[in-house]
Amino acid sequence: MAVTACQGLGFVVSLIGIAGIIAATCMDQWSTQDLYNNPVTAVFNYQGLWRSCVRESSGFTECRGYFTLLGLPAMLQAVRALMIVGIVLGAIGLLVSIFALKCIRIGSMEDSAKANMTLTSGIMFIVSGLCAIAGVSVFANMLVTNFWMSTANMYTGMGGMVQTVQTRYTFGAALFVGWVAGGLTLIGGVMMCIACRGLAPEETNYKAVSYHASGHSVAYKPGGFKASTGFGSNTKNKKIYDGGARTEDEVQSYPSKHDYV
């Protein structure tokens, strides 16, 4: 039963994680205008992977998509790629894991097949989570670099007289959503891999048969042949307590930016 609980929980955690990765990828607040130590403007800039937005104090918000592909920085393209790969792998992993769930019966699917599928989905979730964490971290690193560069530019102007205010950008809500979601997907994947160990069919030791050869009292016992699945044994059918997975993944998104062109 513990195996089913672990598998179920892994599935739910991964599902939440992948939903978070999708949400983060679609969010506009990857970078937000840094308000600290800045002249207070009546305009608030923020940017996502796909478009940049401006919110005026009057409440009017205008978003513009990045309609160029070649004009965008390689790093941004890399982040997009990592997030999309993460989503695709996660989605495939979810699909595979649905069929692998012990509580779902599909025809006469053997436990060894379910164990294989559980491990496959687990690995996919781990890679998916790593892709999301990597993507978010690359973007965060890009922000930090640009932040300090623009900070340096703020205080070095023509003869010390700075006319144009440099807009600095800091971490947006999407980064935190991405990190948390990537982490959850990773944890869910690990749980699926752990569950897979328990799903592998138990080693089948055939009963010893005594062959009585004439004139001899020798008992021949065939060795215990393992049903080879590659996942080890220990699959006693235990009763499991199916505890509900509870997650608190409430992330507030705030209204800021990073020039890509």
Epitope: V43, N45, S57, S58, F60, R64
Partner: antibody, heavy 117, light 113 residues
Framework: VQLQESGAELVRPGTSVKVSCKAS????????IEWVKQRPGQGLEWIGM????????NYNEKFKGKATLTADKSSSTAYMQLSSLTSDDSAVYFC???????????WGQGTLVTVSA | DIMMTQSPLSLTVTAGEKVTMSCKSS????????????LTWYQQKPGQPPKLLTY???TRDSGVPARFTGSGSGTDFTLTISSVQAEDLAVYYC?????????FGGGTKLEIK
Amino acid sequence: VQLQESGAELVRPGTSVKVSCKASGYAFTNYLIEWVKQRPGQGLEWIGMINPGSGGTNYNEKFKGKATLTADKSSSTAYMQLSSLTSDDSAVYFCARGGFGNSFAYWGQGTLVTVSA
Amino acid sequence: DIMMTQSPLSLTVTAGEKVTMSCKSSQSLLNSGNLKNYLTWYQQKPGQPPKLLTYWASTRDSGVPARFTGSGSGTDFTLTISSVQAEDLAVYYCQNDYFYPYTFGGGTKLEIK
């Protein structure tokens, strides 16, 4: 869209006055209400703004402590209270509705406040 | 606070003439996020409240005649009236809508001969 301001006020120095601005013809809580001061024959000065939906305010540092902005959603009316009045506060006070580009798209007719002993 | 400097202080023209007035800000009003300049022009006729002419430096408000044109970027802005009419007698103000506190220029008084 209409912004109807209260009538002219003649007040004593040291007292306070409350100017009202009744909005009609649009969703009151969806737009900011801005307040502007114009002394006779002078230019325009921004006092501050209020978000009628949330009650959030933003003041010009110069008018902090002098002006208090409030809004009543039920009557779609914005208010500006001016305290500790002096002759420097004698002016026409306008309310205006925020628009695109943070502009002041619609204006009230103005309220003349005269501070005199 | 951002200083808004308007010039000339006043100008007198004949009807049908082209008029240009200037507004300079002490800091750039260009927002890099949408590449828009947060400068607004108002017209105030005697005894009336100001009326919005243009926002985002060059976008005419609805109902504003096409003879009014706003232009400029960064710190230098211009309001042009292509063919002045008698009803254009007013004071014209520019306003910084980018930095708090919002600040207005001293105004340019337009008089008709």
